[in-house]
């Protein structure tokens, strides 16, 4: 039975340029995450954090995303095509998988705000 | 450059265990997970499992769990392989393979240490 | 465990032809997918990684294509030294699994 939750920094905001932080955190469950996956707003993969083995980032965002906090990601050098959800799959023994999901609106205006707070979706 | 040097070829009888050596040079040894890959002969290629020598953390595929065990020393830049109770079917070439900066396709690859196990 | 259908098994094929081999996935594994090129007695060396980047100083000939299950190997023109047996790998989650080769021969 899965009891765990999955908790995210939710709808955020960032200046294009910036960077910003995308975190997930699984909570309520004693099972063990073996692997983290990064997806973007068209399911293509940002980057793998197996457990063990370390980071896997996708050459077509080495320059741009970097590895944690944590199991989290950093975006970096944001554009406006940035702007869209994000997921994060946790894959889970003996649970299964769980996933977040995160909405970035990356901003032209200097007066952006990047709200870190955490929501359940 | 990147170089993986194993150790030579090994006969076993079943029942025993192996311990298969990889030195690497030419890179910071800590910055790379560390694979073993094993081909039985005439088969596909067949993964072991994989290290993490900056933490010693290891990942083994179910098949091999329990039975090969992985390790590093990281003073010198060299990482292990050991199977226990051998037995025929094990009788293959055992690869270590670097796994790339940041990525997990193989990258570097050693020459290779041929397993024999007959009784 | 993710399994790796290559297809085919073996072929044959003149110096200059366009060969091309493919690699089927048992689910989804994104663009989590390597080539690799093994000459007898030798060990694998990589060549296409992430499905379609070419790594450091393999030819042009050699491409990769495709994301999700189905993923597709080109070599645009056949050279001599291209004889070897192929294998496609996921690393999309572990087990990391490989297809069963694709071996290569000259007509």
């Known amino acids: 039975m899965m009891t765990g939750t999955i908790e995210t920094t939710g709808n955020i905001s960032a200046k294009k340029g910036g960077s910003v932080i995308l975190q997930c955190h699984l909570s309520s469950t004693m099972a063990q995450v073996t692997q983290v996956n990064w997806e973007q707003h068209d399911h293509s993969l940002l980057a793998i954090r197996n457990a063990e083995l370390g980071w896997h980032i996708y050459p077509a965002f080495k320059d741009r995303v970097a590895p944690g906090p944590g199991l989290g990601l950093t975006l970096q050098s944001l554009t406006m095509n940035d702007t869209g959800e994000y997921f994060c799959t946790y894959h889970t023994y003996p649970d299964g998988t769980y996933r977040g999901r995160i909405f970035l609106e990356v901003l032209e205006s200097s007066v952006a705000e990047h709200s870190a707070r955490f929501q359940i979706p | 450059q990147v170089q993986l040097v194993q150790s030579g070829a090994e006969v076993k009888k079943p029942g025993a265990s192996v311990k298969v050596s990889c030195k690497a040079s030419g890179y910071t040894f800590t910055e790379n997970a560390m694979h073993w890959v094993r081909q039985a002969p005439g088969q596909r290629l067949e993964w072991i499992g994989g290290i993490n020598p900056n933490n010693a953390g290891t990942s083994y595929s179910q098949k091999f769990q329990g039975r090969a065990t992985l390790t590093v020393d990281t003073s010198a830049s060299t990482a292990y392989m050991e199977l226990s109770s051998l037995r025929s079917e094990d009788t293959a070439v055992y690869y270590c393979?670097?796994?790339?900066?940041?990525?997990?396709?193989?990258?570097?690859w050693g020459q290779g240490t041929t397993v024999t196990v007959s009784s | 465990d993710i399994q790796m259908t290559q297809s085919p098994s073996s072929l044959s094929a003149s110096v200059g032809d366009r060969v091309t081999i493919t690699c089927q996935a048992s689910?989804?594994?994104?663009?989590?997918l390597a080539w690799y090129q093994q000459k007898p007695g030798k060990a694998p060396k990589l060549l296409i990684y992430s499905a379609s980047y070419r790594y450091t100083g393999v030819p042009s000939r050699f491409s990769g294509s495709g994301s999700g299950t189905d993923f597709t190997f080109t070599i645009s023109s056949l050279q001599p030294e291209d004889i070897a047996t192929y294998y496609c790998h996921q690393h999309y989650t572990t087990p990391w699994t490989f297809g069963g080769g694709t071996k290569l021969e000259i007509k």
């Open positions: 393979t670097r796994s790339s900066y940041y990525r997990y396709d193989l990258d570097y």
């Open positions: 689910q989804d594994i994104k663009t989590a």
